[in-house]
Interface confidence: medium
């Protein structure tokens, strides 16, 4: 004598006041879990959204963004305009990254170049609007005599002859 309403399967809802206890979800609606009192309206992928997965009686539609936009938020709840590499999106549209900053993606904000000197390194490749700087070895590492071609021989322990 199970509580049948609580056991209506996914894809149905408890329509207990009619002749059936569980009724199939109407068109353009779904229930992804059992025991639902109502079915949820299917998401519609319109405008800047495009359909990635159609709605079924047991699962909601899934949306992507049309070309030139990218998804933001859980389950692609928003579409944000793409910018070019070397740009960031502002309220006034896409703007070039300021000097000293870069963005290597079509989304997100411009970030400052890495400060190589903070790690005691030198700039090997200069940064651009699209690319971060590449840090190289520190100037000290490059000075003559700083590195030896042959590593020093290990010290022998006293009382042991070489093998």
């Amino acid at each position: 004598l199970q509580d049948l309403c609580s056991n209506c399967p996914a894809g149905t809802f408890c329509d207990n006041n009619r002749s059936q206890i569980c009724s199939p979800c109407p068109p353009n609606s779904f229930s992804s879990a059992g025991g639902q009192r109502t079915c949820d309206i299917c998401r519609q992928c319109k405008g800047v959204f495009k359909t990635r997965k159609e709605c079924s009686s047991t699962s909601n539609a899934e949306c992507d963004c049309i070309s030139g936009y990218h998804c933001l938020g859980a389950e692609c709840s928003m579409c944000e305009q793409d910018c070019k590499q070397g740009q960031e999106l502002t309220k006034k549209g896409c703007k070039d990254c300021c000097f000293g900053t870069f963005n290597d993606q079509k989304r997100g904000i411009c970030r400052p170049w890495t400060n190589c000197s903070l790690d005691g390194k030198s700039v090997l490749v200069n940064g651009t609007k699209e690319r971060d700087v590449v840090c190289g070895p520190s100037p000290a590492d490059l000075s003559p005599g700083a590195s030896s071609a042959t590593p020093p021989a290990p010290a022998r322990e006293p009382g042991h002859s070489p093998q």
């Epitope: 004598l1 199970q2 049948l4 309403c5 209506c8 207990n16 206890i21």
Partner: antibody, heavy 113, light 111 residues
């Protein structure tokens, strides 16, 4: 948590009787699926009706019981079964149950002239 | 109304043995709304299995429910003396009238 049936009696054919299922430790203002089942002496189980407590949902009935038997929630601790036009065939122990997992001990109804 | 035909009506078993009880429904049970109950004389029924194969709380794993649609089986293995009882199947149907039906019962006794 427990259920106790009461109201069972010896009645004459054609009489009416109301059985009460009283719950301890269960609040029927919340949603529970409460059922009545009967068992004639030496016979098997026979489902009568079920109701959602704390709800206006349609009760569920056996076709033979609909119209003559009425299940209802009468308080936050009681569910009743009203029976009319009783005949000898209604002689049985009447059980109430919560979703099949919790049962009362039953109350005996005897219909005899 | 739906009819559940339970077979056999009685079975004589040996301690440590296995018994199987079948239940056939005149209509397909909806979404595995199917249960098995155990009843001993002078006691109310006790839920053993629900949703066709899910063991109720506190019921030993010697009890196993299987089946779907119109055909269901209860298997009791490693039988103990305490298993002597009458077993009932119950089916649930997707209608507000005749929502449930019980099988006629199977009495399990020991040789």
């Amino acid at each position: 948590q427990s259920l106790e049936e009461s109201g069972g009696d010896l009645v004459k054919p054609g009489a009416s009787l109301t059985l009460t299922c009283t719950a301890s430790g269960i609040d029927f203002s919340r949603r529970y699926y409460m059922c009545w089942v009967r068992q004639a002496p030496g016979k098997g189980l026979e489902w009568i009706a079920c109701i959602y407590t704390g709800s206006r949902d349609t009760p569920h009935y056996a076709s033979w019981a609909k119209g003559r038997f009425t299940i209802s929630q009468t308080s936050s601790t009681t569910v009743t079964l009203q029976m009319t036009s009783l005949t000898a065939a209604d002689t049985a122990t009447y059980f109430c149950a919560r979703e099949g997992s919790l049962w009362g001990q039953g109350t005996l109804v005897t219909v005899s002239s | 109304a739906q009819v559940l035909t339970q077979t056999p009506s009685s079975v004589s078993a040996a301690v440590g043995g296995t018994v199987s009880i079948s239940c056939q429904s005149s209509q397909s049970v909806y979404s595995n709304w199917f249960s098995w109950y155990q009843q001993k004389p002078g006691q109310p029924p006790k839920l053993l299995i629900y949703s066709a194969s899910t063991l109720a709380s506190g019921v030993p794993s010697r009890f196993k429910g299987s089946g779907s649609g119109t055909q269901f089986t209860l298997t009791i293995s490693d039988l103990e003396c305490d298993d002597a009882a009458t077993y009932y199947c119950a089916g649930g149907y997707n209608t507000v009238i005749d929502t449930f039906a019980f099988g006629g019962g199977t009495e399990v006794e020991f040789k």
